[in-house]
């Protein structure tokens, strides 16, 4: 019961986290105009990974996409890549974890298969969360670096725009959403990995016992074999339990490639 709860909670937490990573990636407020020097501006600038926006006090907002790839800074491209990798891994992880959920029955899927799938999705969530946290942190570091470089006509590193003296950028809401979402995905992944341990069937360890029968000696060793007493007609050793000794190579592989346009 505790395993199912841990797995279910891990799934839900990861789902919320990945939704947050997607939201953060799409948000325009990765960096927002610092209003410290001019709190009464009639024009408010903010920028995302995909476009920059200007909100006028009139109520109108104008957004312009970064229609260049080569003209964009490498750091911004790296952040985009990290966030997209995080989303793709998270999405695949969610897909795998749905089939791995203990409460969902799919054919005659063994617990060991579900355990491996749970572990796989858990690892994917952890990597997804780390990608998001890394992406957001790289962007935040870029902002901090650029913050004091607010000299006239400076290159902002954000879509090749020319900066006037007054405008500096600070952390936007998307950064905090990204950090929280990445953390949640990471936590969800860890919970899935913990649940995996509980899902994996436990090995029954039998201590080696030596039976000294007349004429011959047979040692019964642990490793998944249960012996009869050696007396009477049933003298065969029956393999009644696999002991979960399946190799990683035997784990069923799942699709890991999705097309995101």
């Amino acid at each position: 019961m505790a395993v199912t709860a841990c797995q279910g909670l891990g799934f839900v937490v990861s789902l919320i986290g990945i939704a947050g990573i997607i939201a953060a990636t799409c948000m325009d407020q990765w960096s927002t105009q610092d209003l410290y020097n001019n709190p009464v501006t009639a024009v408010f600038n903010y920028q995302g990974l995909w476009r920059s926006c200007v909100r006028e006090s009139s109520g109108f907002t104008e957004c312009r996409g970064y229609f260049t790839l080569l003209g964009l800074p490498a750091m911004l491209q790296a952040v985009r890549a990290l966030m997209i990798v995080g989303i793709v891994l998270g999405a695949i992880g969610l897909l795998v974890s749905i089939f791995a959920l203990k409460c969902i029955r799919i054919g005659s899927m063994e617990d060991s298969a579900k355990a491996n799938m749970t572990l796989t999705s858990g690892i994917m969530f952890i990597v997804s969360g780390l990608c998001a946290i890394a992406g957001v942190s790289v962007f935040a570091n870029m902002l901090v670096t650029n913050f004091w470089m607010s000299t006239a006509n400076m290159y902002t590193g954000m879509g090749g725009m020319v900066q006037t003296v007054q405008t500096r950028y600070t952390f936007g809401a998307a950064l905090f959403v990204g950090w929280v979402a990445g953390g949640l995905t990471l936590i969800g992944g860890v919970m899935m990995c913990i649940a995996c341990r509980g899902l994996a069937p436990e090995e029954t360890n039998y201590k080696a016992v030596s039976y000294h029968a007349s004429g011959h000696s047979v040692a019964y060793k642990p490793g998944g074999f249960k012996a009869s007493t050696g007396f009477g007609s049933n003298t065969k050793n029956k393999k009644i339990y696999d002991g979960g000794a399946r190799t990683e190579d035997e784990v069923q592989s799942y699709p890991s490639k999705h097309d995101y346009v």
């Epitope: 001019n38 024009v43 600038n45 006028e56 006090s57 009139s58």
Partner: antibody, heavy 118, light 113 residues
Framework: EVQLVESGGGLVQPGGSLRLSCAAS????????MHWVRQAPGKGLEWVSY????????YYADSVKGRFTISRDNPKNSLYLQMNSLRAEDTAVYYC???????????WGQGTLVTVSS | DIVMTQSPDSLAVSLGERATINCKSS????????????LTWYQQKPGQPPKLLIY???TRESGVPDRFSGSGSGTDFTLTISSLQAEDVAVYYC?????????FGQGTKLEIK
């Protein structure tokens, strides 16, 4: 047709109060930031106050801060300017104006005259 | 506060001639986010409210004759009437719409010579 009609102006003694109204028609007021601008007789234009579409942001000129209060009633499509502690230098024609692209004032009312005199 | 200074205070131009009004701001009105200058030009005729002519320093408001044009960037701006008509007699104001308070220039009175 877009129209802004100011009302509430008149003669008032120094230290007195007045409430100006601006009725909008031909557009939905709650989509736009709104301004009050005044013009003393024979003088230039002076911006007075601004209120954002949702009333979340309000700004005043230093000359009226603490004495004037801008407000709006979007369901009634109306803008208001409550003027207290009036002074002789507040004598002017008061215009309400609708904000537009580039923060420009695209539409203006005909104005209402406020005279502060003893 | 941003101070707007217009020159000249008054201008007399012959019909059909070019009229040029200058406006200087004490701070740059260029916004880095969209590379637009937040300066507006208005025309005010006697007994009438002001009328919007130009916004974003160079974008003509719909319905405004194309003889009116705006130019300039940063702190220096110009309103040009390419061929003066009798109906263009008015006072012209530039306005900072970049930072509050939204200050106006003192106005330039345009007359026919």
């Amino acid at each position: 047709e877009v129209q802004l009609v100011e009302s509430g102006g008149g003669l008032v003694q120094p230290g007195g109060s007045l409430r100006l109204s601006c009725a909008a028609s031909g557009f939905t007021l709650n989509n736009f930031g709104m301004h009050w601008v005044r013009q003393a007789p024979g003088k230039g234009l002076e911006w007075v106050s601004y209120i954002s579409s949702g009333s979340g942001t309000i700004y005043y000129a230093d000359s009226v801060k603490g004495r004037f209060t801008i407000s709006r009633d979007n369901p009634k499509n109306s803008l208001y300017l409550q003027m207290n502690s009036l002074r002789a230098e507040d004598t002017a024609v008061y215009y309400c104006a609708r904000a537009y692209y580039g923060n420009a004032f695209s539409f203006w009312g005909q104005g209402t005259l406020v005279t502060v005199s003893s | 506060d941003i101070v707007m200074t217009q020159s000249p205070d008054s201008l007399a131009v012959s019909l059909g001639e070019r009229a040029t009004i200058n406006c200087k701001s004490s701070q740059s009105l260029l916004n880095s986010g969209n590379q637009k200058n937040y300066l507006t030009w208005y025309q005010q005729k006697p007994g009438q409210p002001p009328k919007l002519l130009i916004y974003w320093a160079s974008t003509r408001e719909s319905g405004v004759p194309d003889r009116f044009s705006g130019s300039g960037s940063g702190t220096d701006f110009t309103l040009t009437i390419s061929s003066l008509q009798a109906e263009d007699v008015a006072v012209y104001y530039c306005q900072n719409v970049y930072s509050y308070p939204l200050t106006f220039g003192q106005g330039t009175k345009l007359e026919i010579k």
